[in-house]
């Protein structure tokens, strides 16, 4: 069967070759071919070309529509991983490392501390903070994680907040806080995560992360 198929393919290929060769000869005006024969072959060839071009145009249209749709509403998403910092600042530091996401330049990680968006819209913003603390070693105040927003020309403000009391486990007990919500962001708005004691934050793989997704 396979051999018969091969012979069939070769025969078709040969016919195509003869057809193309005939068109060539028609174009060079070889005497051995009748004018009628040439006209027939030419119109046949034009028909093929027309079909190919129409097909190509349709595909092009579909693709350009897809592109327009994509351009108007591109996926905007980011997921960054916590980074231990020597700075004493209460704002957590993040990095594009490990299994991170940065969809395109419509969202950027600035100064390793804030995610900044270029497009206005509704965003789901989330953060997970894992910390290890001990009641005796810590102050009376609970461990608080805050998700904050900084809009151009305005003060930062708290969007979400969660608090956990310190563990009695020794040397310290691991606990996780998850924050997440949907917020309207303006172009140039930045979001960041603030904690009461950054030295207690766990930076092991998967423990502490931060991200957003445009809806």
């Amino acid at each position: 069967h396979r051999r018969l198929d091969k012979i069939e393919d070769e025969r078709n290929l040969h016919e195509d070759f003869v057809f193309m060769k005939t068109i060539q000869r028609c174009n060079t005006g070889e005497r051995s071919l009748s004018l009628l024969n040439c006209e027939e072959i030419k119109s046949q060839f034009e028909g093929f070309v027309k079909d190919i071009m129409l097909n190509k145009e349709e595909t092009k249209k579909e693709n350009s529509f897809e592109m327009q749709k994509g351009d108007q509403n591109p996926q905007i998403a980011a997921h960054v991983i916590s980074e231990a910092s020597s700075k004493t600042t209460s704002v957590l530091q993040w990095a594009e490392k490990g299994y991170y996401t940065m969809s395109n330049n419509l969202v950027t990680l600035e100064n390793g501390k804030q995610l900044t968006v270029k497009r206005q819209g509704l965003y789901y913003i989330y953060a997970q903070v894992t910390f290890c603390s001990n009641r005796e070693a810590s102050s009376q105040a609970p461990f608080i994680a805050s998700l904050c927003l900084k809009s151009p020309g305005r003060f930062e403000r708290i969007l979400l907040r969660a608090a956990n009391t310190h563990s009695s486990a020794k040397p310290c007990g691991q606990q996780s806080i998850h924050l997440g919500g949907v917020f309207e962001l303006q172009p140039g708005a930045s979001v960041f995560v603030n904690v009461t004691d950054p030295s207690q934050v766990s930076h092991g793989t998967g423990f502490t992360s931060f991200g957003l997704l445009k809806l």
Partner: nanobody
Framework: EVQLLESGGGLVQPGGSLRLSCAAS????????MSWVRQAPGKGLEWVST????????YYADSVKGRFTISRDNSKNTLYLQMNSLRAEDTAVYYC?????????????WGQGTLVTVSS
């Protein structure tokens, strides 16, 4: 009712230090930016420093940059101004001011002020 009560002023020698405090009540302290503004004898008001609601961002007048440090303790509803390397020209009444919501430059409430005198 919003109340801002400054304390910590006094007489200090040039090069010395002072720490001013401002106890706030009557509003959700952690939601507002807070500022220090001063008025030297016979002069107009001069903005000194501002701190954002959760204390992440601070702003200073060029005349005090590197010498003064603004801070806040939201759990105690208190604003601070640590003043180091004081000069004679820092002599003034220092006012604690509450910034209008989401504005860095507008103040809607002021304290009574505390006098700082820098003199040898």
């Amino acid at each position: 009712e919003v109340q801002l009560l400054e304390s910590g002023g006094g007489l200090v020698q040039p090069g010395g230090s002072l720490r001013l405090s401002c106890a706030a009540s009557g509003f959700t302290f952690e939601e507002y930016g807070m500022s220090w503004v001063r008025q030297a004898p016979g002069k107009g008001l001069e903005w000194v420093s501002t701190i954002s609601p959760i204390g992440v961002t601070t702003y200073y007048a060029d005349s005090v940059k590197g010498r003064f440090t603004i801070s806040r303790d939201n759990s105690k509803n208190t604003l601070y101004l640590q003043m180091n390397s004081l000069r004679a020209e820092d002599t003034a009444v220092y006012y604690c001011a509450k910034n209008a919501y989401d504005r860095k430059s507008n103040f809607d409430y002021w304290g009574q002020g505390t006098l700082v005198t820098v003199s040898s």
